[in-house]
Interface confidence: low
């Protein structure tokens, strides 16, 4: 008699979910040297550990403490860059100015990006038919609770000036109910960020509007004023351009506006 | 029910300054949701948009006019205005404000409410 | 500064007919940054298009808009009597300009 098997709202675990978590493991570990020490296969069962054998809509950030623990690696504090709703971007940037992070130039960011996992309560499978969706099913779930952890933790260590890149093209430039907006926002420290600038990339050629007035950016304005950090925004008109200014700083043409 | 009413002499001099004000009534101007402007249209021809401001002060002038455009809000009285220096005949029309939907980044909406409009001559 | 042509400069149909208004854009314009007004004698522009192809609140189906980058068109499928005006196209990239109007009056 086949087994009943819960059905989720979301897609279910990515394919070859532990083959491909070990081998970013191991290709990360070969790249950045500083973090040559780690286990890849003790990062996997820490990993696994975290959601195999349990109900995914009741997932804790204790579940992903021992991975947190294995993971833990130093970023410089003052060259952190979020980013909200334009990952590509930010990741292209990252790529360019090497000396700057997202949280998917981490090992943990980088393990995790992109994939869905979840488990099934009782049993040590993989669930790769379905797995909790945030808003249909549950936020406690495997993916949310891992992006929270990391994300939280993130915030926390950076200092001086943090940048977000932000989406001009979104409905809600700054959106409460993301990632930056319901994690990383609270959990920067006034005490050690003096001011999160961000940078408002725009969609079109054609649009040389100032989306720093945009009510959602003065409403994080006030979020990050409150909590006793300074703020500062710049559109960025010419996304294609600012990438190639920053690869070529020298070039003439990068003096002027992006 | 929003309504907007424009205000002002009908008749300015050649090299004064044109001032107008639009009164905003049913509505608050300081609205998030919202942006302000003002267009106009010479007798018989078509529309040009002279400028834009949001609540908080921030504005966006047409570069033609930019040189001899102001435009302001004034939350406490619910009115903006435009003032536009150095008139010639050429600025004889009927101006309007108006307002538009503010929505960030994906959508720009356009004016959706207007008020009737106010013709303003120049001539001495 | 991006320039908007539209044409016919004047059309001339007979209620029940079909009016198709062309405006078209010196430079892409990103289509949710289109928008159509309707303007009669001595009255003020009224939106009836925005995002290209979203109807304003209260505009009957009969308005519809299409088109993408520089070709945008207002159609409307069968003229009332009450639709015979200027209608105007306008882009708010960044300066916001109007393109000179369409006259639709009555054969």
């Known amino acids: 008699v086949p087994r009943w098997r819960q059905q989720w709202s979301g897609p279910g675990t990515t394919k070859r979910f532990p083959e491909t978590v070990l081998a970013r493991c191991v290709k990360y570990t070969e790249i950045h040297p500083e973090m040559r020490h780690v286990d890849c296969q003790s990062v996997w069962d820490a990993f696994k550990g975290a959601f195999i054998s349990k109900h995914p809509c009741n997932i804790t950030e204790e579940d992903y403490q021992p991975l947190m623990k294995l993971g833990t690696q130093t970023v410089p504090c003052n060259k952190i860059l979020l980013w909200s709703r334009i990952k590509d971007l930010a990741h292209q940037f990252t790529q360019v100015q090497r000396d700057m992070f997202t949280l998917e130039d981490t090992l943990l960011g980088y393990l995790a990006d992109d994939l869905t996992w979840c488990g099934e309560f009782n049993t040590s499978k993989i669930n790769y038919q379905s797995c909790p969706d945030w808003r249909k099913d549950c936020s406690n779930n495997p993916v949310s609770v891992f992006w929270k952890t990391v994300s939280r933790r993130f915030a926390e260590a950076a200092c001086d000036v943090v940048h977000v890149m932000l989406n001009g093209s979104r409905s809600k430039i700054f959106d409460k109910n993301s990632t930056f907006g319901s994690v990383e926002v609270h959990n920067l420290q006034p005490e050690k960020v003096q001011t999160l600038e961000a940078w408002v990339i725009h969609g079109g050629r054609e649009d040389s509007r100032d989306l720093c007035q945009d009510p959602t950016i003065k409403e994080l304005e006030s979020i990050i004023s409150k909590r006793n950090i300074q703020f500062s925004c710049k559109n960025i008109y010419r996304p294609d351009k600012f990438l190639q200014c920053v690869k070529n700083p020298e070039d003439s043409s990068c003096t002027s506006e992006i | 029910q929003l309504q907007l009413q424009e205000s002002g002499p009908g008749l300015v001099k050649p090299s004064e300054t044109l001032s107008l004000t639009c009164t905003v009534s049913?509505?608050?101007?300081?609205?998030?949701?919202?942006?302000w402007g003002w267009i106009r249209q010479p007798p018989g021809k078509g529309l040009e948009w002279i400028g834009s401001?949001?609540?908080?002060?921030?504005?966006y002038y047409n570069p033609s006019l930019k040189s001899r455009v102001t435009i302001s809000v004034d939350t406490s009285k619910n009115q903006f205005s435009l003032k536009l220096s150095s008139v010639t005949a050429a600025d004889t029309a009927v101006y309007y404000c108006?307002?538009?939907?503010?929505?960030?980044?994906?959508?720009?909406?356009?004016?959706?409410?207007w008020g009737q409009g106010t013709m303003v001559t120049v001539s001495s | 500064e991006i320039v908007l042509t539209q044409s016919p400069g004047t059309l001339s149909l007979s209620p029940g007919e079909r009016a198709t208004l062309s405006c078209r854009a010196s430079?892409?314009?990103?289509?949710?940054?289109l928008a159509w007004y309707q303007q009669k004698p001595g009255q003020a522009p009224r939106l009836l298009i925005y995002?290209?192809?979203s109807r304003a609140t209260g505009i009957p189906d009969r308005f519809s808009g299409s088109g993408s980058g520089t070709d945008f068109t207002l159609t409307i499928s069968r003229l009332e009597p009450e639709d015979f005006a200027v209608y105007y196209c306008q882009q708010e990239a960044n300066v916001y300009t109007f393109g000179g109007g369409t006259k639709v009056e009555i054969k």
């Open positions: 049913g509505g608050s101007i300081s609205s998030s949701d919202y942006y």
């Open positions: 430079q892409s314009v990103r289509s949710s940054y």
């Open positions: 401001i949001y609540y908080s002060g921030s504005t």
């Open positions: 995002g290209a192809s």
């Open positions: 108006a307002r538009g939907q503010y929505s960030s980044g994906w959508y720009a909406y356009p004016f959706d409410m």
